[in-house]
């Protein structure tokens, strides 16, 4: 008789999740010399220990502490790029501008990017059928708590000028409920971070509006200023040209505004 299993509203654990995490870890530690001493089996043990046998609506940041410790990574703190609702362009940018880092360019972000996972209370099984949805089921689920925890640590580690890429095509360019708006903004350390510079990415080719004047950007400026961090904002009118100019800064067309 099949055992009754909790049905959640979200998709289940990504297939071959353990193998994927382990393989990503091995690949990452081979490529990044500063992480080559990391034991990927211990990393997987710590990852697994954070959610296996635990109720998937009752996960805490403390559950992830061992994984966070093993994944501690010293990235240049003045080369951090945060993003909100524009992941692909942010990643394309750091693939070209190799000295800058998004969260997904770090070991922990790389391990979990685009994956889903959850377990079940009191069993050592991984749930491949369904996992809690943040809105419909619960916010303290394994995936949400993981990203909240790594995002907080990533923001805490930042210094000097921190950049954030924002999606100018969305109704809320800055969304207080996004990971950036609810976690990262509030965990930048004013004693280390001098400026937050927002890059607002335009969607339409003919969109010449100054989206830095958008009310949600003004709201972000207000939050940041109250935290004693300076704020600046730039419009990126042509993201395609922006990336091209990052690749080839000597190009004559790259002196004009992008």
């Amino acid at each position: 008789v099949p055992r009754w299993r909790q049905q959640w509203s979200g998709p289940g654990t990504t297939k071959r999740f353990p193998e994927t995490v382990l393989a990503r870890c091995v690949k990452y530690t081979e490529i990044h010399p500063e992480m080559r001493h990391v034991d990927c089996q211990s990393v997987w043990d710590a990852f697994k220990g954070a959610f296996i046998s635990k109720h998937p609506c009752n996960i805490t940041e403390e559950d992830y502490q061992p994984l966070m410790k093993l994944g501690t990574q010293t990235v240049p703190c003045n080369k951090i790029l945060l993003w909100s609702r524009i992941k692909d362009l942010a990643h394309q940018f750091t693939q070209v501008q190799r000295d800058m880092f998004t969260l997904e360019d770090t070991l922990l972000g790389y391990l979990a990017d685009d994956l889903t996972w959850c377990g079940e209370f009191n069993t050592s099984k991984i749930n491949y059928q369904s996992c809690p949805d943040w809105r419909k089921d619960c916010s303290n689920n394994p995936v949400s708590v993981f990203w909240k925890t790594v995002s907080r640590r990533f923001a805490e580690a930042a210094c000097d000028v921190v950049h954030v890429m924002l999606n100018g095509s969305r109704s809320k360019i800055f969304d207080k409920n996004s990971t950036f708006g609810s976690v990262e903004v509030h965990n930048l350390q004013p004693e280390k971070v001098q400026t937050l510079e927002a890059w607002v990415i335009h969607g339409g080719r003919e969109d010449s509006r100054d989206l830095c004047q958008d009310p949600t950007i003004k709201e972000l400026e207000s939050i940041i200023s109250k935290r004693n961090i300076q704020f600046s904002c730039k419009n990126i009118y042509r993201p395609d040209k922006f990336l091209q100019c990052v690749k080839n800064p000597e190009d004559s067309s790259c002196t004009s505004e992008i």
Partner: antibody, heavy 123, light 110 residues
Framework: EVQLLESGGGLVQPGGSLRLSCAAS????????IIWIRQAPGKGLEWVAA?????????YYADWAKGRFTVSKDNSKNTVYLQMNSLRAEDTAVYYC???????????????WGQGTLVTVSS | DIQLTQSPSTLSASVGDRVTITCRSS????????LAWYQQKPGKAPKLLMY???NLASGVPSRFSGSGSGTEFTLTISSVQPDDFATYYC??????????FGGGTKVEIK
């Protein structure tokens, strides 16, 4: 009161083995990283290994300690162990166990230390 | 391998003197400021003085202060007291949760 008490040190011949113990009391043992750190006579401090076991042991080692040293834990006895094999003269040191501060803002620092146990490797 | 270099290795001071110890790391510490300072007296275990470069550990007198970021850090004792003659170690926290200690600075009575 937080207490860590090391034992098991002594004289051992090169190539020999030794198991050190670190008995803990006064705190919730499962919720902290316990770190082994050593100090050669008249020299500086050097970290050896770390263990944490809220649910299953999670452990890791200094590069030089991998393969020869093994850290383990017995939660029922509130004790951490350091098994040292293939010992060499350069392993002669006082071995300390220390408790790391808890909380993500404080990890990476050692707030409570044992008194140390001396290991001498000599023929 | 990460190297933490402390200078000077020995320092002679009189009671009331201002003392500064420097610690240089071959790699940036985690978060730019994840560095601690410890005090050790002969035959005793080290005692945590300072964490995250500039935060005073519980019960440590305010004459101790720390500063620095990235790879360069300093520990200052504004007015050395008889109880402060000891050896001081810096300790950094790095990628993969690894630790490294400096070689130590012995503060002795002039």
């Amino acid at each position: 009161e937080v207490q860590l008490l090391e034992s098991g040190g002594g004289l051992v011949q090169p190539g020999g083995s030794l198991r050190l113990s670190c008995a803990a009391s006064g705190f919730s043992f499962n919720n902290y990283w316990i770190i082994w750190i050593r100090q050669a006579p008249g020299k500086g401090l050097e970290w050896v290994a770390a263990i944490y076991s809220p649910s299953g042991d999670i452990k890791y080692y200094a590069d030089w300690a991998k393969g020869r040293f093994t850290v383990s834990k017995d939660n029922s006895k509130n004790t951490v162990y350091l098994q040292m094999n293939s010992l060499r003269a350069e392993d002669t040191a006082v071995y300390y166990c220390a408790r790391e501060l808890s909380g993500s803002s404080y990890e990476g620092y050692f707030e409570s230390w044992g008194q140390g146990t001396l290991v001498t490797v000599s023929s | 391998d990460i190297q933490l270099t402390q200078s000077p290795s020995t320092l002679s001071a009189s009671v009331g003197d201002r003392v500064t110890i420097t610690c240089r790391s071959s790699q940036s510490v985690y978060g730019h400021n994840w560095l601690a300072w410890y005090q050790q007296k002969p035959g005793k275990a080290p005692k945590l003085l300072m964490y995250r470069a500039s935060n005073l550990a519980s019960g440590v007198p305010s004459r101790f202060s720390g500063s620095g970021s990235g790879t360069e850090f300093t520990l200052t004792i504004s007015s050395v007291q008889p109880d402060d003659f000891a050896t001081y170690y810096c300790q950094g926290y790095y990628s993969g949760g690894s630790y490294a200690f400096g070689g130590g600075t012995k503060v002795e009575i002039k």
